[in-house]
């Protein structure tokens, strides 16, 4: 069964800056990745970035530097300390659309006792949804 993992890390140098990494553990080819915060897209979440293998990448503030790390994983940085910026308990979700598996989504947040600059190793996140 395909799985999605989500890793959230607070940067040691910038306490209002987060790095989100997501990956897809499956054999299909990925056609679209959607990253959101505050919950899944369509369930109260806000789109942060969409990444398409051919059509490019779009990101919305406070997201910066959304990019493909591998063919099946992505990362982005969130920065800023304004009203539209993340806090330590913010939930981040990644949805991978792939063929032939369909859409798989997982969510994660900063581990409760995280030291800045540290994070738990990427593991499949607890919230998993297949469409």
């Amino acid at each position: 069964t395909p799985e999605v993992w989500v890793q959230v890390r607070m940067e040691a140098t910038e306490l209002s800056s987060f790095t989100i990494r997501c990956g897809f553990l499956g054999s299909g080819s990925i056609s679209l990745v959607t990253v959101s915060w505050g919950g899944p897209n369509g369930a109260g979440g806000t789109t942060l970035a969409v990444l398409h293998p051919e059509r490019g990448i779009r990101q919305w503030a406070p997201a910066r530097q959304a990019r493909w790390e591998t063919q099946s994983s992505i990362s982005l940085i969130l920065e800023g300390s304004g009203a539209s910026s993340p806090c330590a308990n913010t939930t981040f979700c990644c949805k991978f659309a792939s063929f032939p598996e369909g859409s798989w989504e997982a969510c994660g947040s900063l581990p409760p006792s995280s030291d800045p600059g540290l994070s738990a190793p990427p593991t499949p996140a607890p919230i998993l949804r297949a469409d």
């Epitope: 505050g38 897209n41 789109t47 779009r58 910066r64 539209s84």
Partner: antibody, heavy 119, light 106 residues
């Protein structure tokens, strides 16, 4: 067919507030950012801010913080912009525009709402 | 903040001719630039995004190129309906419009 229908022109007195509406149809309203753009007579286009209808999250151009407040009514697929403490500098045409994501920024626009602030 | 400097502010050209408009960013915006056609009384119309990607309903007379900080937009085989004001927009981070270029036909 995607369509953004804005409210009609308005003539208001200085110091009051006004609410402009933008009704969306032809797509899933909660999936796309709605932006607001200002054009003063004889001048260029200025981005005011955006709202993500699915969550109500907003982001403003620093210049318009305190001047504009963006909201949505998901039940009617309508976005609103409240402009407060109006002065003659706020006289302009205001547009709403959908951000199409990978289809391109501001891919569909409303027809514009002309606001005139005069005593 | 990202600033966009658009030039020229106005230009005049002959029917059937070609015009080129440029936009320069004050920092690298990758390829995140779009071009719009604006006619009073209507909302602006998206012509090109991601530097050179033509919108589905836009004729190939319109084209865009560039990367980094310097970008250009061209219209060839000018037609009467091309009379309008054209704007560039950077969307690498938030949004900034260029100052606009008013196109007239000689």
């Amino acid at each position: 067919q995607v369509h953004l229908q804005q409210s009609g022109p308005d003539l208001v007195k200085p110091g009051v507030s006004v609410k402009i509406s933008c009704k969306a149809s032809g797509y899933t309203f909660t999936d796309y950012y709605i932006n607001w753009v200002k054009q003063r007579p004889g001048q260029g286009l200025e981005w005011i801010g955006w709202i993500f209808p699915g969550s109500g999250t907003t982001y403003y151009n620093e210049k318009f913080k305190g001047k504009a407040t963006l909201t949505v009514d998901k039940s009617s697929s309508t976005a609103y912009m409240l402009l407060s403490s109006l002065t003659s500098e706020d006289s302009a045409v205001y547009f709403c525009a959908r951000d199409g994501g990978l289809r391109g920024p501001f891919d569909y626009w409303g027809q514009g709402t002309t606001l005139t602030v005069s005593s | 903040d990202i600033q966009m400097t658009q030039s020229p502010s106005s230009l005049s050209a002959s029917l059937g001719g070609k015009v080129t408009i440029t936009c320069k960013a004050n920092q690298d915006i990758n390829k995140y630039i779009a071009w719009y056609q604006y006619k009073p009384g209507k909302g602006p119309r998206l012509l090109i995004h991601y530097t050179s990607t033509l919108q589905p309903d836009i004729p190939s007379r319109f084209s865009g190129s560039g990367s980094g900080r310097d970008f250009s937009f061209s219209i060839s085989n000018l037609e009467p309906e091309d009379i309008a004001t054209y704007y560039c927009l950077q969307y690498d981070y938030l949004y900034t419009f260029g100052g606009g270029t008013k196109l007239e036909i000689k």
